[in-house]
Each structure stands twice: as C-alpha cells, then as structure tokens.
C-alpha cells in the first residue's frame, strides 16, 4: 500500500479556467445505453469543456444527453449561466441561485457559500472540491451580491457587472470566480471499471474517481478500457496525480497526496487533503 512520497509542485495553467458545472450530470460520461438504435445526440465533455456529438442507442443512458448542440450548451456551459439579470426593479436572480447545494463528488471539504432559496439567504456549506454546480461561492459577500436581493434593488451578475436599478447602467465590479479542483490526469482515470469480453478472472486495479481510490476488480482478459492496472501502485501513479487545485489566477498546486492526512494552507483557507 506504499505510495510515492512526493512534494507539492507548483505548476502554471493559464489556459483552462476552473471547471464549473451548472448541473452535476454535465460531468457524466457519454452513455450510449444498451440498445443499438442510432440516434445523434450531444453530451458535455468535461475534458474538452465542449458539447460534442455521440451516438445514443435509444434507451437508458444518463442525463448528459441532449437532442441539440444548443440545448447542451444551455444546460452545461458557463456562458449560458452568466446572463445579465433582467432590468426590472424587482430583478430575477440568475437560475443557478435556485440550485440546491451540491458538494460534488470529491473529498476536499472546503468552506463555501450557497444561496438557500428556502431561507432566502446565503449560507455556508462544505464543498468537496470538484464538480458540483454554480451555486457555489468563495465568500459570503460574493454569494450575497449575486443571489440575495440587495438593499438598493440591484444584484450583481456572475461576470461581476453591477446592474443599477435606477438607470439600468452597467458598472464593472470586481468579483472573484470560485476556484475548484480540476482533474488534469489521464481521461481514462474517470472511466468506470470494465471487465471486458472474455471469461478469465484476473486480479486488476482501477481508479474509482468517485471515492478517489484505486480499487480491485476482476478483469476478463480481453477488451475493457485503459482504467486497468496490474498493481495498486501503478494505478495510483497513473491516476492519483491528476487532482490539481487552483491557488491563484495563474497558479495551480498539484496535490500529490501522502499517506498521512496533511494540512495545506491555501489562499487563507485551511483544508484537509485526504489520503486516496
């Protein structure tokens, strides 16, 4: 069960913004389902961060499936969530303010804030560090600005543009975009274990991206996918390195985990990085 004892490495990444999803299902992999019909559908690809075509078999599958490119973009891309709020005196909040708190699938336990539509207030919650939805803010102020009704009858949209209710003028504001964990490892580390097509029962390991651990499974001896390793160490080496946390606009910290729980101080916020 020994893992490589690696240092935290600062790397830079100015190309990809944090992966922020309006809906958790946008992170599901394309699932053609068990039927064999041919239907052109679209899914959101978390690696390319774009809506792409895939062939759907006509039954089952999952929610990351849309009849048109436009519908996919509307549900899963950030641009469509960041609309300027209506210019009436009683302005509407962005749609994502009404999404329920979503800790996501990772285990980072980061303090974040979300707008609770029941209490009509921004409240604290524990965020796992990846995926989730856009009702997720680094600060209470940011959450209030965007989702709570302001005292002067205005709200701030997610680009940080204040809409003045009196004259409908747009005033730039500086609001921070929430920073999230990202997965920068090989894409197959996020695929499910696949036994394959043959009849053997070989002991193999696969990376379970939901629990963040390498787990054993029985491999049939042929077929399957690349999330298939002969040892736990090999699995960890290939897949555990992938979780990266952004610490500033240009910088990322690669959280290569050690076996003991360790405290990492990042951007004034203490979090626990747990062992995989």
């Amino acid at each position: 069960d020994s893992e490589e004892d690696e240092e935290h490495t600062i790397i830079t990444d100015t190309e990809l913004p944090p992966l922020k999803l309006m809906h958790s299902f946008c992170a599901f992999k394309a699932d053609d389902g068990p039927c064999k019909a041919i239907m052109k559908r679209f899914f959101f690809n978390i690696f390319t961060r774009q809506c792409e075509e895939f062939i759907y078999g006509g039954c089952e599958g999952n929610q990351n499936r849309f009849e048109s490119l436009e519908e996919c973009k509307k549900m899963c891309t950030r641009d469509n969530a960041n609309r300027i709020i209506k210019t009436t005196l009683q302005q509407e909040k962005p749609d994502f303010c009404f999404l329920e708190e979503d800790p996501g699938i990772c285990r980072g336990y980061i303090t974040r804030y979300f707008y609770n539509n029941q209490t009509k207030q921004c409240e604290r919650f524990k965020y796992g560090g990846c995926l989730g939805n856009m009702n997720n803010f680094e600060t209470l102020e940011e959450c209030k600005n965007i989702c709570e009704d302001g005292p002067n009858g205005f709200q701030v949209d997610n680009y940080g543009t204040q809409l003045n209710a009196v004259n409908n003028s747009l005033t730039p504001q500086s609001t921070k975009v929430p920073s999230l964990f990202e997965f920068h490892g090989p894409s197959w580390c996020l695929t499910p274990a696949d036994r394959g097509l043959c009849r053997a029962n070989e002991n193999r390991f696969y990376y379970n991206s939901v629990i963040g651990k390498c787990r054993p499974f029985k491999y049939s001896g042929c077929g399957g996918n690349e999330n298939n390793f002969t040892s736990k160490q090999e699995c960890l080496r290939a897949c555990k390195k992938g979780f990266i946390q952004r610490i500033s606009k240009g910088g990322l910290i690669k959280t290569k985990r050690k076996r003991k729980k360790q405290r990492v101080k990042i951007a004034y916020e203490e979090i626990f990085v747990k062992n995989m």
Partner: antibody
C-alpha cells in the same frame, strides 16, 4: 410529419436482384437516426434486414450479409435496398422504417419472387 | 441470434377485460419493444424500451419486464385493440421479432 414511401418492382425473377427505394419526406436522412429495411413474410413473420445511419454507416442482418446492400442518395433524401440472388423465399412485404422501434414505417410494398 | 417466443399465439377477450401477453427471449435483452399491426396496415410502434408508450397509444396499455421475460398488458380491452402484437429486441444484431400474439375481441 415524417413520411416514408417504398417503391420498386412488385415481381422479380429468381436469381436476379431485388431493388427498392424508400423516399423520405419531412425529415432529412442525414440529420439523425438509422433508416431500416424490414420485411414481413406471407406467414406474417417479421425480419429486420439492415439499416443505414444518418452518417452513412450500415449494419446488416448476418443471415443476409452476403446478399444485401443498403445505400442512399442524400440529394433526393432516399435510401435503397438491394438484395442479390433472390429466391422464392424472399417473397415478402418490404417496409422501410426510421429507427425501427420508435419511428414511422412506410406502408410497405409486396415483392413476389417468381419465374 | 436471440429468439423471441410470444404467448399465447391467439388471445380472445371481451371488452373491459384485462389481458396480458408475454414475450420470452432465448437470451437476456436490455429492453423489449412492441408493435401493433392491423390487417392491411404496416406495424406501428406501440411500446418502446419496455414500458414507454409511443405517441397516441392509450394509457390502458402498459409494458413491463426485464432480462428474458417481458409482457404487454391492456387493463380494459376495447374493440379497437383487436390486432396482432409483436415484440422486438434491439439489443443484439440481428434485431429479431417475436412471432406475434393475435388479440381477438369477442
């Protein structure tokens, strides 16, 4: 509304080729779905023969693979069935259908194989 | 290939009765699909992916099942339901049909 219409000769001689056309109106065959040929024998038994997908890929019933070809003409929004070396056993009503189990079928055309 | 066996071959029912017809597959399939065919007409998609009613199908029809055993049920049969019903699997090439259940209304 999507409509499919089969056309072709109603009588074919044994050992010749059977050729049928399915003309689709109200929907582009390059937009989506698989476009199927299905036949129904005189005793009412149904057999899926094959399809051509919106992208042009084909899939055939293995029992017919050596004799069947499904092609298309996208400019006319038509797809075609060619069945070679026919015998009297190929006498049937031939249907074209969009994505067999949830789409419209044509009204069918009876093809008799006889000398 | 997967063979689909339908039973009964002939089903006779009076209006208002509940009827069930079954379709058994020689190997497990992910879903079953059903068609209704009336004399002189082409088959119409009736129930797809085991339990989903096709457009225009009355709510008295339902489908269920899994693995190798599937069924189509009509809660209160009406005269217009007289037809032959075929099951079809779309899980394994070749995509096969059952031999049909003919429903007669007394």
């Amino acid at each position: 509304d999507v409509q499919l219409q089969e056309s072709g000769p109603g009588l074919v001689k044994p050992s010749q080729s059977l050729s049928l056309t399915c003309t689709v109106s109200g929907y582009s065959i390059t937009s989506d779905y698989a476009w199927n040929w299905i036949r129904q024998f005189p005793g009412n038994k149904l057999e899926w023969m094959g399809y051509i997908s919106y992208s042009g890929s084909t899939s055939y019933n293995p029992s017919l693979k050596s004799r069947i070809s499904i092609t298309r003409d996208t400019s006319k929004n038509q797809f075609f069935l060619q069945l070679n070396s026919v015998t009297t056993e190929d006498t049937a009503t031939y249907y074209c259908a969009r994505w067999a189990y949830d789409g419209p079928w044509g009204q069918g055309t009876l093809v008799t194989v006889s000398a | 290939q997967i063979v689909l066996s339908q039973s009964p071959a002939l089903l006779s029912a009076s209006p208002g009765e509940k009827v069930t017809m079954t379709c058994r597959a020689s190997s497990s399939v992910s879903h079953m699909h059903w068609y209704q065919q009336k004399p002189g007409s082409s088959p119409k998609p009736w129930i797809y992916a085991t339990s989903n009613l096709a457009s225009g199908v009355p709510a008295r029809f339902s489908g269920s099942g899994s693995g190798t055993s599937y069924s189509l049920t009509i809660t209160r049969v009406e005269a217009e339901d007289a037809a032959t019903y075929y099951c079809q699997q779309w899980s394994s090439n070749p995509f096969t049909f059952g031999s049909g259940t003919k429903l007669e209304i007394k």
